[in-house]
């Protein structure tokens, strides 16, 4: 999947754009908002009716090297009595993010953008059954 | 930056960290071919903490369209289909990386940007701190 060119007529390519070889793009990986701290809701992963755990995945050839993945703790959902109820199901919620992959081919190095699917948390849903006769 | 294992036979001039600026292929590699997104889009209606999806569009960003979730109710939907305010619907937020055109309007020059998105909602037990 290619990154779309700026297609809007009101965009004029500025003279200040850096020269880029064909088929590639220049990417500054100094992250904008890198140090912005977000106030996340307090331990919602444990208080949810579809609770989840976190696992950190580490890959030194990926930037960022650390990606956190959630896994639903239960198959069903936790009811008002604190017991698991399988008439409802815990399901993972996923979101795509971008990472930069560094590839070694002999002594040369290339960089590739990659979409990674991150499981962010879980929600409790009504199960659906498709019955095929 | 992060440390990269290097082939020991290669010249030692290469920096072990990711350089600040890299040239990348225009094609984005998507290794998630085994995912099945076709049915997951109805969570927002089937959840006990349902949400609406709002389109956030920015042509200076890739991806230019990001969908933001907003919880429909303060409470959660109970077994009878009514909103139960003893439980709370809360957004699940995630920091993701996107590309920002830099300098602005340039077709092939980007910078990574971290943004916070609400991906969906989950139903939680509220915490009440009583201050005497």
């Amino acid at each position: 999947r290619k990154i779309p060119k700026v297609g809007h007529t009101f965009f004029q390519k500025p003279e200040s754009c850096p020269p880029v070889p064909g088929g590639s793009m220049k990417l500054d990986i100094g992250i904008i908002n890198e140090n912005q701290r977000v106030s996340m809701s307090r331990n919602i992963e444990s208080r949810s009716t579809s609770p989840w755990n976190y696992t950190v995945t580490w890959d030194p050839n990926r930037y960022p090297s650390e990606v956190v993945q959630a896994q639903c703790r239960n198959l069903g959902c936790i009811n008002a009595q604190g017991k698991e109820d399988i008439s409802m199901n815990s399901v993972p919620i996923q979101q795509e993010t971008l990472v930069v992959r560094r590839k070694h081919q002999g002594c040369s190095v290339s960089f590739q953008l990659e979409k990674v699917l991150v499981t962010v948390g879980c929600t409790c849903v009504t199960p659906v059954i498709h019955h095929v006769q | 930056g992060i440390t990269i294992p290097r082939n020991p036979g290669c010249p030692n001039s290469e920096d072990k960290n990711f350089p600040r600026t890299v040239m990348v292929n225009l094609n984005i590699h998507n290794r998630n071919t085994n995912t099945n997104p076709k049915r997951s889009s109805d969570y927002y209606n089937r959840s006990t903490s349902p949400w609406n999806l709002h389109r956030n569009e920015d042509p200076e960003r890739y991806p230019s369209v990001i969908w933001e979730a907003k919880c429909r109710h303060l409470g959660c939907i109970n077994a009878d289909g009514n909103v139960d305010y003893h439980m709370n619907s809360v957004p699940i937020q995630q920091e993701i990386l996107v590309l920002r055109r830099e300098p602005p309007h340039c077709p092939n020059s980007f910078r990574l940007e971290k943004i916070l998105v609400s991906v969906g909602c989950t139903c939680v037990t509220p915490i009440v701190h009583h201050v005497a």
């Epitope: 198959l75 199901n89 399901v91 993972p92 849903v125 009504t126 199960p127 659906v128 059954i129 498709h130 019955h131 095929v132 | 995912t35 099945n36 049915r39 997951s40 969570y43 089937r46």
Partner: nanobody, 119 residues
Framework: EVQLVESGGGLVQAGGSLRLSCAAS????????MGWFRRAPGKAREFVTL????????SYADSVKGRFTISRDSAKNAVYLQMDNLKPEDTAVYFC????????????WGQGTQVTVSS
């Protein structure tokens, strides 16, 4: 295309046991979870048990907890339901169901297998 076939139902006296089997076709069978649900005349459909395919973690409805055991055999693409200490209220048609992608959308096939518990 995955398909499931259930077997092992029958007529049994209260307190007896049955073992239901569910065989899945399809070489690349890697579901998120599988389960058994039942339909009894005049009653709502009820999930009795679920199993995570990757971890083998199990969950049961209160009505069968301690009496029913679900298990899986990854090599045979099969799930089993061991039903012990059966009660007349367990009488129903039992269906095997598969959630392929973890979205709680289950596919089931065919007529199921009839379990009848006499008192």
């Amino acid at each position: 295309e995955v398909q499931l076939v259930e077997s092992g139902g029958g007529l049994v006296q209260a307190g007896g046991s049955l073992r239901l089997s569910c065989a899945a076709s399809g070489r690349t069978f890697r579901p998120y979870r599988m389960g058994w649900f039942r339909r009894a005349p005049g009653k709502a459909r009820e999930f009795v048990t679920l199993i995570s395919w990757s971890s083998g973690r199990t969950s049961y409805a209160d009505s069968v907890k301690g009496r029913f055991t679900i298990s899986r055999d990854s090599a045979k693409n099969a799930v089993y339901l061991q039903m012990d200490n059966l009660k007349p209220e367990d009488t129903a048609v039992y269906f095997c169901a598969v959630d392929l992608s973890g979205d709680a959308v289950y596919d089931s096939w065919g007529q199921g297998t009839q379990v009848t518990v006499s008192s």
